[in-house]
Interface confidence: low
């Protein structure tokens, strides 16, 4: 039929990168490129029915469905989904084709189904069959990794039994401190299961599928480091596999290490031992302990002895589940406007956490950094000076925990007002919470000096939106002030400012800003 | 929940010196802002001094040069040293943090 427009229909998904996230925008910021969805003509409908291919969507993805439309004239079109009409409002791109969209911004169930597309051409009606469903993704797991032995090698394992299969990687690094973050040029990836270089200073397994990454660090001690002024400690639940790796460098290979438990020494195959020389002529020895199946009566202090240094120890401590310790107490914080500040949050968890900092409804990514004593710490600064409520949340997989944050940001107020034909309200958001005063201009007072007190009626309210107070202050008309000029000024310790309403005028009321 | 109390008002003749305290109970004062207010009898009440969380002062212009604003983190305490103290000074002092107001104590200039 030659009547029937050419018809493209294509999926657009939006990347979630943080430079969207938090923006109230209503259009998604960064795209992939559209990936076309056929829209092919369906064959026996009654009427002219374009079926785009099936859509699958990951939960909380964006997308957005749009159709291309090669057709002479203006269009005019409806969405419908689950028998609601939806607004449409098509536009021409460059090449003077008709565009219709539809976003989706971060999918949910309620928003997986059919979406119809009627539209009307100056030659022909057609509708468009878009079928969204969400990705099942029940069955994916992401385990975080743990280490075997290898058979008859000196080598170890990383296994993490996920769905879909994960890759894994070990992630390595010979250099203290910060130079170990994962970007830095001091660290090596290997994408393989076995590792047979066990002398690097940092050792991590990583495994990563479609639901993220989940990395386990080989725990150390290392002789030649200076001990840590709180001892270090490893949390394991019951049937997890312990590993504990010590490390030591000698000028020559004339020591040797052991491994005891509470003062006895570790049972044989409990334990083994490897050395290497260094570049510069030193020997290197580890000893590895480990215990494939932990219990209760495998917690305690392991301490390493070496003939040539000082003994060092851990605590182990075996737990039945996981669990996330900190203060979860509110916290309240005031600051100026151009004040550096951040939130942070101090906790121990095991296994480790996954968090997100959540401001009036928006989500944003959570960095947690390990600090000596065993706690980790979770940092939030882009607030941006925005004043209300900040929600931290982390959670692994048997505790969740959440703290509040209040954000007071120090400003002088700003009037907003508004009348009524029976009173007069002025609104400030200013913080410290502003003090109100109503002054009456008149002849008598040209300059307003004429305090109003009868009538006037203080509140603070909450904007649930942001957590953020406001204060608001209502002036009851009287006879007395019927018709004048009346002045409502907000003030606190950082200034004063005032709006001047005319009271009784007819149609809108002028109000004029005073500051 | 921060609680607030003020202490040290009491009467002085023109010219006289008083030292103010305020005592908070709550972890975040040492991360927080504290004003001194006044309210003298039938006026509005007025802020008279500021001390940040890094130490940096300020002070209601009139005041600056008689009131000294100060803190002591580990007590938790807040002082306002009040200088030549002159019978408009008369009022009832409180001390703030976030939303959180004290008493107030009783400051009267009198010969």
């Known amino acids: 039929n030659q009547d029937l427009p050419v018809i493209k229909c294509v999926l657009i998904n939006h990347k979630n990168n943080d430079s969207s996230v938090g923006k109230s925008s209503s259009y998604p910021m960064v795209s992939e490129s559209p990936e076309d969805l056929g829209c092919a003509l369906r064959p026996q409908s009654s009427g002219t029915v374009y079926e785009a291919a099936a859509v699958e969507v990951d939960v909380s993805a964006s997308i957005t469905l749009q159709v291309l439309v090669d057709a002479p004239g203006n269009i005019s079109c409806l969405w419908v989904f689950k028998h609601s009409s939806l607004n449409c409002q098509p536009h021409f791109d460059l090449q003077n084709r008709g565009v219709v969209s539809m976003v989706i911004l971060k999918m949910t169930e309620t928003q997986a189904g059919e979406y119809l597309l009627f539209i009307q051409s100056e030659a022909t009606n057609y509708t468009i069959l878009f079928t969204v469903s969400i990705r099942n993704t029940l069955l994916y797991t992401l385990r975080r990794p743990y280490f075997r032995k290898m058979e008859n090698q000196d080598a170890l394992v990383c296994i993490s039994e996920s769905v879909p299969e994960p890759i894994v990687e070990w992630v390595l690094c010979d250099s203290q401190g910060e130079s170990c973050k994962e970007e830095s040029p001091a660290v090596v990836k290997k994408e393989e299961k076995v590792l047979h270089e066990l002398f690097g200073t940092d050792i991590r397994c990583c495994a990563r599928n479609e639901l993220g990454r989940e990395c386990t660090r080989l725990f150390t001690i290392d002789l030649n480091q200076t001990p840590q002024t709180t001892l270090p400690q490893l949390f394991l639940k019951v049937g997890e596999p312990l590993w504990i790796r010590c490390k030591a460098v000698h000028v020559n290979h004339g020591f040797g290490l052991t491994w005891e438990l509470e003062n006895k020494a570790l049972e044989e195959g409990n334990y083994f031992e490897m050395s290497t020389y260094s570049t510069n002529r030193t020997m290197i020895r580890i000893l590895f302990a480990f215990v494939s199946s932990v219990a209760r009566n495998d917690t305690g202090y392991y301490t390493c002895s070496s003939s040539k240094h000082p003994s060092q120890s851990a605590l182990v401590t075996i737990v039945e589940k996981g669990f996330i310790n900190a203060t979860n107490s509110s916290e309240d914080y005031e600051i100026d406007q151009y004040e550096e500040f951040c939130f942070s949050v101090r906790f121990k968890a095991y296994p480790q956490i996954r968090c997100t900092w959540t401001f009036s409804r928006k989500s944003f990514p959570c960095e947690q950094k390990g600090l000596d004593n065993g706690y980790s710490i979770s940092k939030f600064c882009n607030h941006k000076h925005q004043p209300g409520e900040y929600i931290f949340h982390a959670e692994n997989d048997d505790a969740q925990f959440t703290k509040m944050f209040t954000l007071n940001i120090r400003r002088k107020p700003q009037v907003l007002a508004e009348a009524s034909a029976s009173q007069a309200s002025c609104f400030s958001d200013g913080y410290p919470l502003p003090s109100w005063t109503w002054k009456k201009c008149s002849d008598k007072s040209p300059n307003c000096t004429e305090e109003i007190t009868e009538g006037v009626w203080n509140r603070k309210a909450n904007r649930k939106v942001f957590g953020q107070w406001v204060s608001s202050s209502t002036l009851n008309m009287s006879e007395a002030i019927k018709g004048f000029l009346v002045k409502c000024c907000a003030y606190n310790s950082l200034g004063t400012s005032c709006e001047t309403i005319l009271l009784n005028s007819p149609g809108p009321f002028p109000f004029i800003q005073d500051n | 929940q921060v609680q607030l109390q003020e202490s040290g008002g009491g009467l002085v003749q023109p010219g006289g010196s008083l030292r103010l305290s305020c005592a908070a109970s709550?972890?975040?004062?040492?991360?927080?802002?504290i004003d001194w207010y006044r309210q003298a009898p039938g006026k509005q009440r007025e802020w008279v001094a500021q001390?940040?969380?890094?130490?940096?002062?300020h002070y209601e212009p009139s005041l600056k040069g008689r009131f000294t604003i100060s803190r002591d983190n580990a007590k938790n305490t807040a002082y306002l040293q009040m200088n030549s103290l002159k019978p408009e000074d008369t009022a009832v002092y409180y001390c703030?943090?976030?939303?959180?107001w004290g008493q107030g104590t009783q400051v009267t200039v009198s010969s």
């Open positions: 709550g972890s975040t004062f040492g991360r927080n802002y």
């Open positions: 001390i940040t969380s890094g130490g940096n002062t």
């Open positions: 703030r943090i976030l939303d959180y």
